[in-house]
């Protein structure tokens, strides 16, 4: 077996030397030599580096712009970026969550299958037979038609996916 010609996992090759990378949260100030160590410095306030690296500059933390409906979900550290999410009633337009849009409402005839979160929109579903929704809502599920029988009433008007059944009294003339 040949000896390693590459550096070890947390090292990089520079000037024929295998130097230690800087650990997360630190940036490279100077490369190692045969007799000096890699010099690293911690990232400043509002900066981060999330990997073992040889970067000479740290990355700026993401800014959660309230004008775009964003707020801080998790504050960044020297090793992690800030995580943004959307204000109540809004959700991210992308995985990176760079802006927000208002949660969609489910139209009459449709109910909420899954309520929206900060990162996903409302999921609507058509109300199946026996269920209805008569409002436009981001929260309401399809409601079951009223059971006239349990109230000792009869159906006077059939329900639809947008309207409930209308119940009425039993026909007294009927035997």
């Amino acid at each position: 077996p040949e000896p390693p010609t590459a550096c070890r996992e947390k090292q990089y090759l520079i000037n024929s030397q295998c130097c230690s990378l800087c650990q997360p949260g630190q940036k490279l100030v100077s490369d190692c030599t045969e007799f000096t160590e890699t010099e690293c410095l911690p990232c400043g306030e509002s900066e981060f580096l999330d990997t073992w690296n040889r970067e000479t500059h740290c990355h700026q933390h993401k800014y959660c712009d309230p004008n775009l409906g964003l707020r801080v979900q998790q504050k960044g550290t020297s090793e992690t970026d800030t995580i943004c999410t959307c204000e109540e009633g809004w959700h991210c337009t992308s995985e990176a969550c760079e802006s927000c849009v208002l949660h969609r409402s489910c139209s009459p005839g449709f109910g909420v299958k899954q309520i929206a979160t900060g990162v996903s929109d409302t999921i609507c579903e058509p109300c199946p037979v026996g269920f209805f929704s008569n409002v436009s809502s981001a929260f309401e599920k399809c409601h079951p038609w009223t059971s006239c029988e349990t109230k000792d009433l009869v159906v006077q008007q059939a329900g639809t996916n947008k309207t409930d059944v209308v119940c009425g009294p039993q026909d007294r003339l009927r035997a």
Partner: antibody, heavy 121, light 107 residues
Framework: QVQLVQSGAEVKKPGASVKVSCKAS????????MHWVRQAPGQGLEWMGW????????NFAQQFQGRVTMTRDTSISTAYMEVSRLRSDDTAVFYC??????????????WGQGTLVTVSS | DIQMTQSPSSLSASVGDILTITCRAS??????LNWYQQKPGKAPNLLIS???RLRSGVPSRFSGSGSGTDFTLTISSLQPVDFTTFYC?????????FGQGTKVEIK
């Protein structure tokens, strides 16, 4: 200002275990493999194995497999080497040494001061 | 495993002498060979890496040569501090192995 500082001398009975520590300072501990070398009294140097401080992975010389354990605690930049089921012929000075790789060679550039382990009944 | 055979295992010499220590590998190790000096009660200290690269701070009276299986450490003019033990080491493949050492004594 790289330093490898080892724990103090130990006297152990046959069958016991001993754990030697090696505290690193002056460099990024997880960036360099740490090796252990044994030297019996009046004898030569014997390579025992290495530990990757980042992952904890190890590689041992065959005669040390099974009885020697190498571990590390990255939070305190310390490597450990434990020998179990000690015998009187395990009496030796144990050294930790840092590995340096260049494109022309691989060598130990820094050594601990050594830890004498005496096994005696 | 690669065997490293150092010779002689001990020798007597005088201050000012030229000294040659040899190290033979049981198989080709290219130039993955290091020389260390060890003073009594101390850890070894690297003198030469890659068969011939003198470590900075090591006196120029030390030199190394060789490749493949045969290597030499030469001390051009022995000084009183040189009466210690010298080891060769191969790092071509694990297990890394050392020569048995050469002890240099004052004649």
């Amino acid at each position: 200002q790289v330093q490898l500082v080892q724990s103090g001398a130990e006297v152990k009975k046959p069958g016991a275990s001993v754990k030697v520590s090696c505290k690193a300072s002056g460099y990024t501990f997880a960036g360099y493999y740490m090796h252990w070398v044994r030297q019996a009294p009046g004898q030569g140097l014997e390579w025992m194995g290495w530990i990757n401080p980042d992952s904890g992975g190890t590689n041992f010389a065959q005669q040390f497999q099974g009885r020697v354990t190498m571990t590390r605690d990255t939070s305190i930049s310390t490597a450990y080497m434990e020998v179990s089921r000690l015998r009187s012929d395990d009496t030796a000075v144990f050294y930790c040494a840092r590995e340096k790789i260049t494109m022309t060679g691989i060598y130990f550039d820094y050594w601990g001061q050594g830890t004498l382990v005496t096994v005696s009944s | 495993d690669i065997q490293m055979t150092q010779s002689p295992s001990s020798l007597s010499a005088s201050v000012g002498d030229i000294l040659t220590i040899t190290c033979r590998a049981s198989q080709n190790i290219t130039t993955y060979l290091n020389w260390y000096q060890q003073k009594p009660g101390k850890a070894p200290n690297l003198l030469i890496s890659a068969a011939s690269r003198l470590r900075s701070g090591v006196p120029s009276r030390f030199s190394g040569s060789g490749s493949g299986t045969d290597f030499t450490l030469t001390i051009s003019s022995l000084q009183p501090v040189d009466f210690t033990t010298f080891y060769c080491q191969q790092t071509f493949t694990t297990p890394w192995t050392f020569g048995q050492g050469t002890k240099v004594e004052i004649k």
